[in-house]
């Protein structure tokens, strides 16, 4: 991204109101605001010789106000000053960022690529959850309110977690389990989730939304071929008519004694009542 002020603009004595400008504070002049007004026509910027070159007021020392930006340290030289710049900066006043991808400027696992803009040395592509030119800022992912149905959002850094209210489930608390909460399916029924809704799968002999209603297992006439249905504490029993067998009397017994079943279960003869478990 372009620098805000004109490149090289003195960070101490210049400022800008428009991008690219370098406007000088009082007492300073020049394209980069590096020249003290009182000495701009002098051969020497300061010191005893100033009086002999027509300068009435000696200018400030080269290191006055520390002209070195970005934490650089200033040392005076016979005619000017010198900045010792910290790693990653260079230029007369340490104003130039020399950081490249080789310096590893992208934090939090950001991917560094060389900038397409000639004035941009690198660009960080940030991983989810981070932003800023160096991926240094954590995105407040919870501010997007990802947890539904009043769930509490927890940003764990590596992932988001939703702590769901009772009756809701799913990564974002999107499933409404309200009627299943607290064993809402009675009499041994089990709660089945499906498509964000729920239902109770009831044990035999029970029905209704919550499996609270007692059901007649023989009401649906489950025994085929004229078999007689008997309600039993653990289910229903079909007493088959002659010539039929099976839990629901669904298999005919052939005249030669063979049946359509591969074999009768051990301990059971064809024609015996079959318990449906």
């Amino acid at each position: 991204a372009p620098l805000v002020c004109r490149a090289g603009c003195s960070p101490e004595h210049g400022f800008c109101e428009q991008p690219g400008e370098c406007r000088c504070l009082e007492g300073w002049t020049g394209p980069l605001c590096t020249v003290p007004v009182s000495t701009s026509s002098c051969l020497s910027p300061r010191g005893p010789s100033s009086a002999t070159t027509g300068c009435l007021v000696p200018g400030p020392g080269p290191c006055d106000g520390n002209p070195c930006a970005n934490g650089g340290s200033c040392s005076e030289t016979p005619r000017s000053f010198e900045c010792t710049c910290p790693r990653g900066f260079y230029g007369l006043r340490c104003e130039v960022s020399g950081v490249t991808c080789a310096d590893g400027p992208c934090f939090n696992g950001g991917l560094c690529v060389g900038g397409a803009d000639p004035d941009s040395a690198y660009i960080c592509h940030c991983p989810p959850g981070f932003q800023g030119s160096n991926c240094e800022k954590r995105v407040d992912r919870c501010s997007l309110q990802p947890c539904r149905n009043g769930g509490l959002c927890l940003d764990l850094g590596h992932a988001l977690r939703c702590r769901c209210r009772a009756g809701f489930a799913g990564p974002r608390c999107e499933h409404d389990l309200d009627d299943c909460a607290g064993r809402a399916c009675a009499n041994g029924g089990t709660c089945v989730e499906g498509g964000g809704a729920h239902r109770c799968s009831c044990a035999l002999g029970f029905g209704g939304r919550d499996c609270r209603e007692r059901a007649d297992p023989c009401a649906a006439r489950p025994c085929a071929h004229g078999g007689r249905c008997y309600a039993h504490f653990s289910g229903l029993v079909c007493a088959c008519a002659p010539g039929y067998m099976g839990a629901r009397c669904e298999f005919p017994v052939h005249p030669d004694g063979a049946s359509a079943l591969p074999a009768a279960p051990p301990g059971l003869r064809p024609g015996d009542p079959q318990r449906y478990l």
């Epitope: 372009p2 620098l3 004109r6 490149a7 090289g8 109101e17 428009q18 991008p19 690219g20 400008e21 002049t29 020049g30 394209p31 980069l32 590096t34 020249v35 701009s40 026509s41 002098c42 051969l43 020497s44 910027p45 005619r79 000017s80 000053f81 230029g91 007369l92 130039v96 960022s97 803009d117 000639p118 004035d119 040395a121």
Partner: antibody, heavy 119, light 107 residues
């Protein structure tokens, strides 16, 4: 990448005016000074002045005040220099250049526009 | 105005030589000096800024030095493509001013 494309050369009559254009591409035009430089054989390079397109603020070399005037059109990313009351002394190649961003000075230059003033 | 004096209008050199082009400012300009190379019929090309920093893409055989009033552009291991005119420029004070140029020629 940064590119500066200048208008073609002109043969002008003394006393006339000429307007040279410099079309910029590859960067944010508003944010960087466009510099204007004159070059005559045997006279080296002379800085005429500069304009910051975003604000329209200009700085002229005293020597060229009244001779050159700068404008910029941010909608077309084009800077202009008008030279008035032309004389044979104004016959020269005129360059536009762009001030550096991280690197002070004139790292980017147009190809130059030759202005010839002759009766 | 600050006068940038390039005392040598011409310098002779051979391929592989080391050559130094000098520039003297009429007053202290800190290190706010740039160097440019220009070949006949071409626009100037930026080489050095802040007296000693190479612009991107400039071969490292070009080095700049100096501060205050005395500046030098050194070309080590001169190549045939380096035969051109070299200008110094100060951007410490308005108006920005250039040296008159030094033309590098083959011996």
């Amino acid at each position: 990448q940064v590119q500066l494309q200048q208008s073609g050369g002109d043969l002008m009559k003394p006393g006339a005016s000429v307007k040279i254009s410099c079309k910029a591409a590859g960067y944010t035009f508003s944010n960087y000074y466009i510099e204007w430089v004159k070059q005559r054989p045997g006279h080296g390079l002379e800085w005429i002045g500069e304009i910051l397109p975003g604000s329209g603020s200009t700085t002229y070399n005293e020597k060229f005040k009244g001779k050159a005037s700068f404008t910029a059109d941010t909608s077309s990313n084009t800077a202009y220099m008008q030279l008035s009351s032309l004389t044979s002394e104004d016959s020269a190649v005129y360059y536009c250049a762009r001030w550096g961003a991280r690197e002070p000075g004139f790292p980017y230059w147009g190809q130059g526009t030759l202005v010839t003033v002759s009766a | 105005d600050i006068v940038m004096t390039q005392s040598q209008k011409f310098m002779s050199t051979s391929v592989g030589d080391r050559v130094s082009v000098t520039c003297k400012a009429s007053q202290n300009v800190g290190t706010n000096v740039a160097w440019y190379q220009q070949k006949p019929g071409q626009s100037p090309k930026a080489l050095i800024y802040s007296a000693s920093y190479r612009y991107s893409g400039v071969p490292d055989r070009f080095t700049g030095s100096g501060s205050g009033t005395d500046f030098t552009l050194t070309i080590s291991n001169v190549q045939s493509e380096d035969l051109a005119e070299y200008f110094c420029q100060q951007y410490n004070n308005y108006p920005l001013t250039f040296g008159a140029g030094t033309k590098l020629e083959l011996k």
